[in-house]
């Protein structure tokens, strides 16, 4: 008789990434009998929740349930009903909620409480909502990309599964840029990690890793922009802010109260003789770059070397995957190609920022103006952060790989988070077993 395929024995997991600007739901799937194998978990769905990040619901917590409905219903459709009850759901909140918690632990807790109650109403196995630390965010991002790149696998392959994969088992560093924070995580070369807060020790698949990580709160692209505006308005002579980080001809009115609505701008706060000011773009990359550099304090370093603001950073080592907003921004600017040198990126940014706003709007008619207007700043910020903040050079730039997805799974902290919480990354190398006989009868 002919062999018949059995129904696939698969498992699912759901992770919600509650970021500062929005929430995304990811659904992962893996073969049940291969849980401990490396590289078997893959993403089957991403659902972006409509609306802002959950921290913005602090004055309207009763709206959180409706906000999450569409994506949770999508998960109900994608995951077979028979699997619902055993599918774990995790929500991790990042820097937007860290900032809210700085303002009030109760406010952050109230938001999470309503989120938990909303998610508990679904037929899945809800495992909790929490604010993850910056260290966790960096670590899980590093685990995600190295898991997807097959770096934890002991089997050396003669083929590459992704264009930038090298055959060696050297791990990739992880560069993550969000709206409110940015993380840098990598294995330094024989370098002691001078600050204990930045040191992580992992044993994964039988190998030890000494990992450096740091999360810079307030240095995500959105909070960095608020910081820059708060800094620059201090020295404006009137309620007009001529801003080199926006295209010539661009105009936008900003409420001073909005500017100071984040802990990130506190150090620049002052009484201004106006309640609103107008940004007028002048589109000058070099001046924008100079203005951004003023956000990085490089005058103080209590270690052998620092990134900025007195934070230890070992010498950069190996290849890096740059994902999340690093990727989205550079992809929009068409600068993700491996062949584009740092000098070329700078050149193209100069041209892009100098383009008149009316021209930009016409060229990118399908893009929301709020996002479109900020690409000049964001691109310049990425260059400033990588070059002056993290000390990449024109030569080491080629070691940065702007990554959106690896084998269909988004690069980011969520997969690493789920792998950890479901105990799918063993400390020891699993014993190799013969091929499973369960596939056919």
């Amino acid at each position: 008789t002919q062999n018949k395929a059995l129904p696939e024995n698969v498992k699912y997991g759901i992770v919600l990434d509650a970021g500062s600007s929005h929430t995304s739901l990811y659904i992962y799937k893996w073969p049940a009998e291969k849980e401990n194998d490396t590289g078997v978990v893959h993403q089957v769905e991403e659902c972006r929740v409509k609306g802002p990040g959950i921290s913005k619901f602090v004055q309207k917590v009763n709206e959180i349930g409706i906000y999450l409905t569409d994506c949770m219903e999508r998960a109900r459709e994608v995951i077979p009903r028979s699997q619902h009850q055993e599918t774990p759901v995790y929500l991790g909140a990042t820097a937007g909620m860290r900032l809210l918690r700085m303002e009030s632990e109760e406010l952050a807790d109230r938001v999470l409480d309503v989120v938990e109650r909303s998610l508990s109403n679904y037929p899945f196995d809800f495992q909790g909502a929490r604010i993850i630390t910056g260290q966790e965010e960096g670590a899980y991002g590093w685990i995600t990309i190295n898991y997807l790149l097959g770096k934890f696998s002991q089997k050396t392959r003669w083929f590459s599964i992704v264009p930038y994969e090298t055959n060696n088992q050297e791990t990739f560093g992880a560069l993550d840029l969000g709206g409110a924070s940015t993380q840098v995580t990598f294995v330094p070369q024989n370098q002691t990690i001078e600050s204990p807060d930045n040191a992580l020790q992992f044993r994964l698949y039988g190998k030890d890793y000494n990992v450096y990580t740091h999360s810079f709160l307030c240095y995500g692209k959105d909070q960095a922009l608020w910081q820059k505006l708060a800094k620059d308005i201090q020295v404006a002579s009137n309620e007009i802010l001529r801003d080199p980080c926006f295209h010539p001809g661009y105009k936008k009115v900003v409420n001073v109260s909005d500017l100071y609505k984040t802990p990130c701008t506190k150090r620049f706060e002052m009484t201004l003789p106006f309640q609103q000011f107008e940004i007028q773009g002048i589109g000058n990359y070099q001046q924008c770059h100079q203005s951004i550099l003023e956000l990085f304090n490089t005058s103080y370093c209590p270690y052998s070397q620092c990134a900025f603001n007195g934070i230890f950073l070992p010498p950069l080592q190996g290849d890096f995957g740059a994902f999340s907003a690093f990727y989205f921004v550079m992809k929009f600017l068409n600068l993700t190609s491996e062949k584009v040198s740092q000098e070329k990126v700078t050149e193209m940014m100069k041209k892009f920022c100098a383009q008149p706003w009316e021209e930009i709007k016409t060229s990118y008619a399908g893009v929301k103006e709020k996002y479109l207007s900020e690409y000049c700043f964001s691109g310049t910020y990425i260059l400033s952060l990588l070059l002056q903040g993290y000390h990449f050079t024109a030569d080491s730039w080629e070691h940065i790989h702007f990554i959106g997805k690896i084998q269909g799974s988004d690069a980011g902290w969520t997969l690493g988070y789920m792998l950890n919480l479901t105990n799918m990354i063993p400390a020891e190398q699993p014993l190799s077993t013969p091929l499973s006989h369960s596939t056919y009868v």
Partner: antibody
């Protein structure tokens, strides 16, 4: 030393307005949430309004909602309470109080209080 | 609003004895319960924050416990200077206070 000094209280007729001020010193004002709490003569404490450190959260007791407005000027280290449409039941000693902190996080409890300013609403 | 009910309304304790004041919330407030002491003609003074943490400068004779809906302030041993009104306050929702407990020293 942390100091909170209220001013602006007095005798006012029902339906009229009054503006209370609180001058803060001895701490970095813009790092802390600030509040107004009142106490009617011989009665207990009643929270009136809160203004979180970064103005993310501004809230009022139901008894004053729509009539009172809290504001702050971080450069002047000052907190204000604009009280409109005053009623006899608003008669109380009004305290300015600072939010506490749980380590690095803000907390909605009150770690320092001023001496209060008396508001009497009577015709 | 979350209603806080303090008991007893008043109590008299001899110096050296233990005084216990309870505060019950109409719904769970996690550990977001705080305690204040108010002496006549003075503003309230923070004693305990987040259920069990002693505020700066407060003697260790004062302690707090509880979580959810039931909380306790204990003064042991009581001293003559502890004569005052004591209030609980929750911060899980917009702040509310208990009605107060009057402590007298015999």
């Amino acid at each position: 030393e942390v100091q909170l000094v209220e001013s602006g209280g007095g005798l006012v007729q029902p339906g009229r307005s009054l503006r209370l001020s609180c001058a803060a010193s001895g701490f970095t004002f813009n790092n802390y949430g600030m509040n107004w709490v009142r106490q009617a003569p011989g009665k207990g404490l009643e929270w009136v309004s809160s203004f979180s450190s970064s103005s993310t959260y501004i809230s009022y007791a139901d008894t004053v909602k729509g009539r009172f407005t809290i504001s702050r000027d971080n450069a002047k280290n000052s907190l204000y309470l604009q009280m409109n449409s005053l009623r006899a039941e608003d008669t109380a000693l009004y305290y300015c109080a600072r939010h506490g902190r749980y380590g690095g996080y803000g907390g909605f409890y009150f770690d320092y209080w001023g001496q209060g300013t008396m508001v009497t609403v009577s015709s | 609003d979350i209603v806080l009910t303090q008991s007893p309304a008043s109590l008299a304790v001899s110096p050296g004895q233990r005084a216990t004041i309870t505060c019950r919330a109409s719904e769970g407030v996690k550990s977001y319960m705080h305690w204040y002491q108010q002496k006549p003609g003075q503003p309230p003074k923070l004693l305990i924050y987040k259920a069990s943490n002693l505020a700066s400068g407060v003697p260790a004779r004062f302690s707090g416990s509880g979580s959810g809906t039931d909380f306790t302030l204990t003064i042991n041993p009581v001293e003559a200077d502890d004569t005052a009104n004591y209030y609980c306050q929750q911060s899980w929702n917009d702040p509310t206070f208990g009605q107060g407990t009057k402590l007298e020293i015999k």
